[in-house]
């Protein structure tokens, strides 16, 4: 019946490996979008929400055209590790209001973990160095209030959504060059 969902298919074709990473990224993007929409419905919040501990968005005008695969994969893995930690933190620190979204946050964390494993595999297949984050992970303190955790959730999901869009676009663009 084929490999179980979590186990990567053995392949020496970088395009197939990249495809597999794109599929997981797109799938995670859809989940994130859905969860962000749920958040907006349950906890309406005007304007952009920022969290200083989140990574800055990798993509800016002009950068996509000059991307190289090692840079994209390394940056993506580092950024997604940060989002993984933030989702973990959110699940632990969330007040009662966010507990209603616990199953969805748990599923999101599991999918993030799976994508991180796939990226790690892809990097090792392509013999790329498994880069460590530029800076050690800063411990995340508890949110100041229930509203603080809601704002943090908006920021985390919004940032992850944009990061995953950057990833899909970057990876598919690179695939055309392989």
């Amino acid at each position: 019946p084929g490999p179980p969902a979590g186990s990567p298919r053995v392949s020496s074709d970088p395009r197939a490996d990249l495809d597999s990473a794109v599929l997981l990224t797109r799938s995670l993007l859809a989940d994130t979008r859905q969860l962000a929409a749920q958040m907006r419905d349950k906890f309406p919040a005007d304007g952009d929400h920022n969290l200083d501990s989140l990574p800055t968005l990798a993509m800016s005008a002009g950068t996509l055209g000059s991307l190289q695969l090692p840079g994209v994969l390394t940056r993506l893995r580092v950024d997604l590790m940060s989002y993984f930690r933030h989702v973990q933190w959110l699940r632990r620190a969330a007040g009662p209001s966010l507990k209603t979204l616990e199953p969805e946050l748990g599923a999101l964390q599991a999918r993030l973990e799976r994508l991180l494993r796939r990226l790690q595999l892809l990097m090792s297949r392509l013999a790329l160095p498994q880069a460590a984050p530029d800076q050690p992970a800063v411990p995340l303190g508890p949110p100041a209030s229930a509203w603080g955790s809601i704002r943090a959730a908006h920021a985390i999901l919004g940032g992850l959504h944009l990061t995953l869009d950057w990833a899909v676009r970057g990876l598919l663009l690179l695939k055309t060059r392989l």
């Epitope: 495809d19 002009g62 869009d165 950057w166 695939k175």
Partner: antibody, heavy 119, light 111 residues
């Protein structure tokens, strides 16, 4: 109501440039990518490229790389497409379309801008 | 680039009849449960309108007589019972890879 309103028809000489605008309303501009599609007479629809309004990061169909430039003005919820070194084959209707992040299907379209390239 | 071929090029039917439009891709546009094919309707002088996304999902506001099916390389748009306003040109589009490409269209005409 979600709407994309494009600038009016243009007539240009070969070698010139054209810049088309697309004003978005009724939704959060940065929640979707803005894509551009060409429809030349008797030809199939052709994807030119897209831009993420949040970051201003564009990607292009290789066929249009170097001639098409996509930009956004976030504060005005407006996207722009500039096409340079125009030739007769660029005579077409150009559409902006709202693109779902990461999936490239287009659920809202502008009314189209006709560009005629003629000497 | 992936090439999409639509058939027939034109189709003449009467209101109330069932329409079946086909779209074939030069390589698979499906992967692990997702099919990256979308369908649009276009009337003369108007912009295209999204009907179906990801092969079988009906876009909000589109009548239930429209449905999409298929996987791999072969996809179908079905209109169960044609209404006067359905006579138009229909395009399929893929987003499996970059660049997204469109089919050449099927023109649905009144018999």
């Amino acid at each position: 109501e979600v709407q994309l309103v494009q600038s009016g028809a243009e007539v240009k000489k070969p070698g010139a440039s054209v810049k088309i605008s697309c004003k978005a309303s009724g939704y959060t501009f940065t929640d979707y990518n803005m894509d551009w599609v060409k429809q030349a007479p008797g030809q199939r629809l052709e994807w030119i490229g897209d831009i993420n309004p949040h970051s201003g990061g564009p990607i292009y169909n290789q066929k249009f790389t170097g001639r098409a430039t996509l930009t956004v003005d976030k504060s005005a919820s407006t996207a722009y497409m500039e096409l340079s070194s125009l030739r007769s084959e660029d005579t077409a209707v150009y559409y902006c379309a709202r693109g779902e992040l990461g999936h490239w299907y287009f659920d809202v379209w502008g009314q189209g801008t006709t560009v005629t390239v003629s000497s | 680039d992936i090439v999409l071929t639509q058939s027939p090029a034109s189709l003449a039917l009467s209101p109330g009849e069932r329409a079946t439009l086909s779209c074939r891709a030069s390589k698979s546009v499906s992967t692990s449960g997702y099919s990256y094919i979308h369908w649009y309707q276009q009337k003369p002088g108007q912009a295209p309108r999204l009907l179906i996304y990801l092969a079988s999902n009906l876009e909000s506001g589109v009548p239930a007589r429209f449905s999409g099916s298929g996987s791999g390389t072969d996809f179908t748009l079905t209109i169960s019972s044609l209404e006067e306003e359905d006579f138009a040109t229909y395009y399929c589009q893929h987003s499996r890879d970059l660049p997204p490409t469109f089919g050449q269209g099927t023109k649905l005409e009144i018999k």
